[in-house]
């Protein structure tokens, strides 16, 4: 799913107000529900029909430093007798994320949004024949 | 997957420079990547032999306002025949991201993150047996 | 083996109660967690109420809210289901599971996902 694009509102003060000073806005120290609880099934890409690999990404400037994306390991899916079946489709479940640059020269450190495409598992599919008139 | 917690060395400046005022930092406008693209397979949610379907969420005080969450259709999977097989699971696949909350009193506006747990789409799994001994 | 065999089901007037148990073999609660669902003629599966023994929480479909509660003897590793104030529409075949998954914020089709086995099923036939 595609975040939409700001538009350049969203972090403006209302009309009346000074604008922001430099281009830069208070971005408040810690995160809301930080401890929120996950859970989701064990060992899923595994189990799936769609199964997946997943490849962690490390960037120490970036919040989250550790961003894991998924690969699917098949065309086809994964038939009841373990065999891929290529007559179905393993496709990738994409979704758009944002992340936190940090940026310092010296002791002048700043943040930055930046969105980030992130693969989060695999579904198996059916072919579909689309555009033939 | 989850996001790990901030730890609170990452939003902090080096050791050698004066700490940041009033536990806010600074954050730029404008997004990096704000035009990257989405190419996810069509119509995958109806497609999925563990179809979902889509709910919006709409928060004008976040960025995104617009947080789209996925819900499985079927505890079982969709069959060849179009079918549900019992013997198979829909499960949720789910991602923590990161949304931006807006506060505003007045003309002073500042902005915190915040962790959101989204259910991007569902996979088929084999039923596992696991803990018993 | 991981078994789960459910009972007390049969025919009930509306407005009238019956007890359902899922008895459980071969893992205990603290394994897994318990669901019942059910299966109306032409219908799919649907999710009735969960149970996790962990905390004690409990989740019921809206459909059922208010009328059906679902408790637990440990000691005989049996899960209980009692409907009360029965209507037509409940009629169907109830299934006991043993569910990986419990999350009622979840985006499944129902709070408990994930089956790792079903019971045989039992009838229950509300008539008008």
């Known amino acids: 799913r595609k975040i939409p694009k700001v538009g350049h509102t969203f972090f403006q003060k209302p009309e009346s107000c000074p604008p922001v000073p430099g281009g830069s806005m208070k971005l408040d120290i810690g995160i809301i529900n930080e401890n929120q609880r996950v859970s989701m099934s064990r060992n899923i890409e595994s189990r799936s029909t769609s199964p997946w690999n997943y490849t962690v990404t490390w960037d120490p400037n970036r919040y989250p430093s550790e961003v894991v994306q998924a690969q699917c390991r098949n065309l086809g899916c994964i038939n009841a007798q373990g065999k891929e079946d290529i007559s179905m489709n393993s496709v990738p479940i994409q979704q758009e994320t944002l992340v936190v640059r940090r940026k310092h020269q010296g002791c002048s450190v700043s943040f930055q949004l930046e969105k980030v495409l992130v693969t989060v598992g695999c579904t198996c599919v059916t072919p579909v024949i689309h555009h033939v008139q | 997957r989850k996001i790990p917690k901030v730890g609170h060395t990452f939003f902090q400046k080096p050791e050698s420079c004066p700490p940041v005022p009033g536990g806010s930092m600074k954050l730029d406008i404008g997004i990096i990547n704000e035009n990257q693209r989405v190419s996810m397979s069509r119509n995958i949610e109806s497609r999925s032999t563990s179809p979902w379907n889509y709910t919006v969420t709409w928060d004008p005080n976040r960025y995104p306002s617009e947080v789209v969450q996925a819900q499985c259709r079927n505890l079982g999977c969709i069959n060849a025949q179009g079918k549900e097989d019992i013997s198979m699971n829909s499960v949720p696949i789910q991602q923590e991201t990161l949304v931006v909350r807006r506060k505003h009193q007045g003309c002073s506006v500042s902005f915190q993150l915040e962790k959101v747990l989204v259910t991007v789409g569902c996979t088929c799994v084999t039923p596992v047996i696991h803990h018993v001994q | 083996e991981v078994q789960l065999v459910e009972s007390g089901g049969g025919l009930v007037q509306a407005g009238g109660s019956l007890r359902l148990s899922c008895a459980a073999s071969g893992f205990t609660f603290d394994d897994y967690d318990i669901g019942w669902f059910r299966q109306a003629p032409g219908k799919e599966r649907e999710g009735v109420s969960c149970?996790?023994?962990?905390?004690?929480?409990?989740f019921y479909a809206d459909s059922v809210k208010g009328r059906f509660t679902v408790s637990a003897d440990n000691a005989k590793n049996t899960v209980y289901l009692q409907m009360n104030s029965l209507e037509p529409e409940d009629t169907a075949v109830y299934f006991c599971a043993a569910v990986n998954t419990f999350d009622e914020s979840a985006y499944a089709a129902f709070a408990c996902y994930d089956v790792v086995r079903w019971g045989q099923g039992t009838q229950v036939t509300v008539s008008s």
């Open positions: 149970f996790t023994s962990s905390d004690g929480r409990t």
